[in-house]
C-alpha cells in the first residue's frame, strides 16, 4: 500500500517551488491539462549555454514525512537530446541530480540551507533512458522517463526534495512522493493494523477480531516488510468465541443463528441444538433444555438434554424368613440416558400399627442405592412386621428435577416370630435308665413360652422309629426307660402362640452303668 505525501498531478494551485539562483535560464513552472482537462503543473529548465560551474536548483515545499522512514520519489521527466539543440555547448548535459534535506519544520529560505551537497544529501544522479529529439518547427518526439528513487532513512519531521540542473534541457513533468505501508490485514480472525515499516522487517502484533479469542500458543504476529508487503508466514491466530463461527473467509466471527450453538472456542461451525434443547437468541454457546429436561453437571455442553426415568416396573418379592429378595423390571422410559441406577426407600409397621422409616438393623445387598442391577436382598426383617419398599429408578439428571420421584411400591409382611432355639441343656441327674434335664427359658418375642418339646434318640440309632418325643410345660424334663450306660442325643424346642421355634443344638448325655453309682448330678 502506498501513502502519498505529495503528488504534483493532484495539486490544484501553483507549486511555487523555490529556485536558486535568481538568474535567467532558471527552472520555470508551466501549466497544462491532463486527459480529463484538469490543470497540471510541470517545471522546465533549458540553460544549455550556462556559465561553467553554474547550477540551477529547484526545491519543493516542505513535506511532512508522516512517520515514514523511507520515502520513494517517482519522477516523470523528459530530456532533450543535446544534439537536438543548435545552441548547445559542451556544457549541455543529459542528467540531473536529486537531493533531499531534512528539518523538523518548514525553515528553509531562498538562501538557506546552503545550496550544495552537505547540507543537502545526494540521492542520485538521474540519467534519461529516453531522449527527446527536437527539429526546428516540428513537434518534439520522445518517451517520458519514469524513475523511482529511495530516500532515507529519515528521522526529522519533514524534508525538502531538491533538483540540481547543470546544463540539461528538461521538463520535470510530475513528482510523486510516497511511502509504503502494510495495509490493514485480517487473516485467521486476527487483525493486523496498518503499519509503516521502520526497518527491513517489522514484527506486528495482531489482535483478535470482534467475538474471537486468542488461540493457544504465542500471541499472533506478522512481519511487515519494507516494501509494504506482509511477509508470508503462517499465523497462529485467533478463533471464534463460543457461540460464534468463522465467516467471510476467516475474517469475521458470525453469531450462531437461532436454533444453533457452538460450545467451544476454536474451529468448527455452529451446530443444530441437540435433542430436547433450543436457543432463542443468536450467539448461543449452549442450547437451553426444554422444560423438564436437564443436563448433568458432567455432561458436555453439546450433549442432548435428558429427563429422569420413569418408575421401575413389576417388583417381585420372595420372602424367606427374615430375608427378602426383591426383583424388578427396568423403567419404560430411561430419560435418554445410560447412567440408570436404582434406590429403595423402606418403611416398617409394627404389629400394633405404628410405622416409621426402617431401622438400621436391616441390611441391603448390594446396597439400598446406586444399584445397577434390578434386584436386592434385604436381610434382618423382623417377624410380624409389614414392610413397604419403594423402588425408584434414577439417572444423572434426577437430582436436577423438581417434584416427586416416581416409584414402584411393594408391601411385604413377615411371619410372627417363634421362640428361638433352646440351648444350654444340662443333665441334672442320671441313672442307668433315666436322665433328668434342665435348660434356660428362651426369650420369646411374641408372647410367653407355652410348652416345650424334647426330641431324643440313642446315639447310633438314626432311623425315625428310634426318635422319641416328650412334651413338658416346665423348662425341665425326665427321660425314662433308657438303656444302661447308653449315649443319647437330646434337642429341645419351645412353643409360643406363634408356634414352635427351631430345635436347638443336639446335646450329648449318658446313662449310668449300675445302681451302685447312685444318682449323680451332671453338668452339661
Amino acid at each position: 500500500l502506498e501513502e502519498t505525501l505529495l503528488n504534483t498531478k493532484l495539486e490544484t494551485a501553483d507549486l511555487k517551488w523555490v529556485t536558486f539562483p535568481q538568474v535567467d535560464g532558471q527552472w520555470e513552472e508551466l501549466s497544462g491539462l491532463d486527459e480529463e482537462q484538469h490543470s497540471v503543473r510541470t517545471y522546465e529548465v533549458c540553460d544549455v549555454q550556462r556559465a561553467p560551474g553554474q547550477a540551477h536548483w529547484l526545491r519543493t515545499g516542505w513535506v511532512p514525512r508522516r512517520g515514514a522512514v523511507h520515502v520513494y520519489a517517482t519522477l516523470r521527466f523528459t530530456m532533450l537530446e543535446c544534439l537536438s539543440l543548435p545552441r548547445a555547448g559542451r556544457s549541455c548535459k543529459e542528467t540531473f541530480t536529486v537531493f533531499y534535506y531534512e528539518s523538523d519544520a518548514d525553515t528553509a529560505t531562498a538562501l538557506t540551507p546552503a545550496w550544495m551537497e552537505n547540507p543537502y544529501i545526494k540521492v542520485d544522479t538521474v540519467a534519461a533512458e529516453h531522449l527527446t529529439r527536437k527539429r526546428p518547427g516540428a513537434e518534439a518526439t520522445g518517451k517520458v522517463n519514469v524513475k523511482t528513487l529511495r530516500l532515507g532513512p529519515l528521522s526529522k519531521a519533514g524534508f525538502y526534495l531538491a533538483f540540481q540542473d547543470q546544463g540539461a534541457c528538461m521538463a520535470l513533468l510530475s513528482l510523486h512522493l510516497f511511502y509504503k505501508k502494510c495495509a490493514q490485514l485480517t487473516v485467521n480472525l486476527t487483525r493486523f493494523p496498518e503499519t509503516v515499516p521502520r526497518e527491513l522487517v517489522v514484527p506486528v502484533a495482531g489482535s483478535c477480531v470482534v467475538d474471537a479469542v486468542p488461540a493457544p500458543g504465542p500471541s499472533p504476529s506478522l512481519y511487515c516488510r519494507e516494501d509494504g508487503q506482509w511477509a508470508e508466514q503462517p499465523v497462529t491466530g485467533c478463533s471464534c468465541a463460543p457461540g460464534f463461527e468463522a465467516a467471510e473467509g476467516n475474517t469475521k466471527c458470525r453469531a450462531c443463528a437461532q436454533g444453533t450453538f457452538k460450545p467451544l472456542s476454536g474451529e468448527g461451525s455452529c451446530q443444530p441444538c441437540p435433542a430436547n434443547s433450543h436457543s432463542n437468541t443468536i450467539g448461543s454457546a449452549v442450547c437451553q433444555c426444554r422444560v423438564g429436561y436437564f443436563r448433568a453437571r458432567t455432561d458436555p455442553r453439546g450433549a442432548p438434554c435428558t429427563t429422569p426415568p420413569s418408575a421401575p416396573r413389576s417388583v417381585v418379592s420372595r420372602l424367606n424368613g427374615s430375608s427378602l429378595h426383591l426383583e424388578w423390571s427396568a423403567p419404560l422410559e430411561s430419560g435418554g440416558r445410560e447412567d440408570l441406577t436404582y434406590a429403595l426407600r423402606c418403611r416398617e409397621c409394627r404389629p400394633g400399627g405404628s410405622c416409621a422409616p426402617c431401622g438400621g438393623d436391616l441390611t441391603f445387598d448390594p446396597g439400598p442405592r446406586d444399584l445397577v442391577e434390578p434386584w436386592v436382598v434385604v436381610r434382618g426383617l423382623r417377624p410380624d412386621f409389614t414392610y413397604t419398599f419403594e423402588v425408584t429408578a434414577l439417572n444423572g439428571v434426577s437430582s436436577l428435577a423438581t417434584g416427586p420421584v416416581p416409584f414402584e411400591p411393594v408391601n411385604v409382611t413377615t411371619d410372627r416370630e417363634v421362640p428361638p432355639a433352646v440351648s444350654d441343656i444340662r443333665v441334672t441327674r442320671s441313672s442307668p435308665s433315666s436322665l433328668s434335664l434342665a435348660w434356660a427359658v428362651p426369650r420369646a418375642p411374641s408372647g410367653a413360652v407355652l410348652d416345650y418339646e424334647v426330641k431324643y434318640h440313642e446315639k447310633g440309632a438314626e432311623g425315625p422309629s428310634s426318635v422319641r418325643f416328650l412334651k413338658t410345660s416346665e423348662n425341665r424334663a425326665e427321660l425314662r426307660g433308657l438303656k444302661r450306660g447308653a449315649s443319647y442325643l437330646v434337642q429341645v424346642r419351645a412353643r409360643s402362640e406363634a408356634g414352635y421355634g427351631p430345635f436347638g443344638q443336639e446335646h450329648h448325655s449318658q446313662t449310668q452303668l449300675d445302681e451302685s453309682e447312685g444318682w449323680r448330678e451332671q453338668l452339661a
Epitope: T12, D14, K16, E29, L30, L33, S39, A140
Partner: antibody, heavy 126, light 108 residues
Framework: QVELVESGGGLVQPGGSLRLSCAAS????????MSWVRQAPGKGLEWVSA????????SYADSVKGRFTISRDNSKNTLYLQMNSLRAEDTAVYYC???????????????????WGQGTLVTVSS | DIELTQPPSVSVAPGQTARISCSGD??????VHWYQQKPGQAPVLVIY???KRPSGIPERFSGSNSGNTATLTISGTQAEDEADYYC???????????FGGGTKLTVL
C-alpha cells in the same frame, strides 16, 4: 519578426456576428497556447478565451460562454474568435495574446502573456 | 475563482519609488504577472512569476508576492513609466485567467 496581428473588427448591430483573426509570425505557432483578451473603452483588461497548442482544449470567461468560439488553424498560423449574439457590452478592443511557451513541449505553457497584438476594435451598436 | 483588487491610481514624484499593490485571497500561493499599458498601445509584460523580469525590461521594475498581496515596485520612477499597470494570475477553471482592475500610475 515575432508578432501578432489582429483583424476582423468593426461595427456590428446587437445580435449580430463577427469573426476576428490573429495572424502569428516569427515563432512556432503550433507550440503556443493562445488567448483573446478584451478592453472596453476606458476600462481594464478582461480575459475572454484560451486555446491550447493543438486546439483540442478551450476555455471561456462566463460573460461570453455559449456565444463566442475560439479556434485555430496551425497550418495558417492563425487564431480565430467567432462572436455570435453580440451585445453592446461586448464593445471593446480585442487583443490576441500568446502564453509563455515551453522550450519544446507544447502540452504545457507558462501562465503569463508574453506577446500581445496591437488589438482590433469591435463596436456593437444599433 | 479569485478576484484581484488594485488601487485605481498611484502618484509618485520622478526618481521616487512607486508601489502598486494587487490583493486577493491567498494570492501568495499563486504566481502573479504584471503588465504595463500606455495609452493606445497593447499591454507589455514587465514582471512574471512574481519577481522575474523579461529581457528588455529595466532593472528598476521588481515584484514580490506573499500572503494576500503582490506588489509591483518601480524604484527611481521615470516619466516614461506613467501608464496603466495590471496584475494577472490564472484560475482553476482550466486555462482561465483573471486581471486586476488596473492602476493608473501618474508621475508628478
Amino acid at each position: 519578426q515575432v508578432e501578432l496581428v489582429e483583424s476582423g473588427g468593426g461595427l456590428v448591430q446587437p445580435g449580430g456576428s463577427l469573426r476576428l483573426s490573429c495572424a502569428a509570425s516569427g515563432f512556432t505557432f503550433n507550440n503556443a497556447w493562445m488567448s483573446w483578451v478584451r478592453q472596453a473603452p476606458g476600462k481594464g483588461l478582461e480575459w475572454v478565451s484560451a486555446i491550447n497548442a493543438k486546439g483540442q482544449f478551450t476555455s471561456y470567461a462566463d460573460s461570453v460562454k455559449g456565444r463566442f468560439t475560439i479556434s485555430r488553424d496551425n497550418s495558417k498560423n492563425t487564431l480565430y474568435l467567432q462572436m455570435n449574439s453580440l451585445r453592446a457590452e461586448d464593445t471593446a478592443v480585442y487583443y490576441c495574446a500568446r502564453k509563455g511557451m515551453s522550450f519544446y513541449n507544447n502540452k504545457y505553457a507558462k501562465s503569463m502573456f508574453d506577446l500581445w497584438g496591437q488589438g482590433t476594435l469591435v463596436t456593437v451598436s444599433s | 475563482d479569485i478576484e484581484l483588487t488594485q488601487p485605481p491610481s498611484v502618484s509618485v514624484a520622478p526618481g521616487q519609488t512607486a508601489r502598486i499593490s494587487c490583493s486577493g485571497d491567498n494570492l501568495g500561493k499563486k504566481y502573479v504577472h504584471w503588465y504595463q499599458q500606455k495609452p493606445g498601445q497593447a499591454p507589455v509584460l514587465v514582471i512574471y512569476y512574481d519577481s522575474k523580469r523579461p529581457s528588455g525590461i529595466p532593472e528598476r521594475f521588481s515584484g514580490s508576492n506573499s500572503g494576500n498581496t503582490a506588489t509591483l515596485t518601480i524604484s527611481g520612477t521615470q516619466a516614461e513609466d506613467e501608464a496603466d499597470y495590471y496584475c494577472q494570475t490564472w484560475t482553476l477553471s482550466h486555462m482561465g485567467n483573471v486581471f486586476g482592475g488596473g492602476t493608473k500610475l501618474t508621475v508628478l
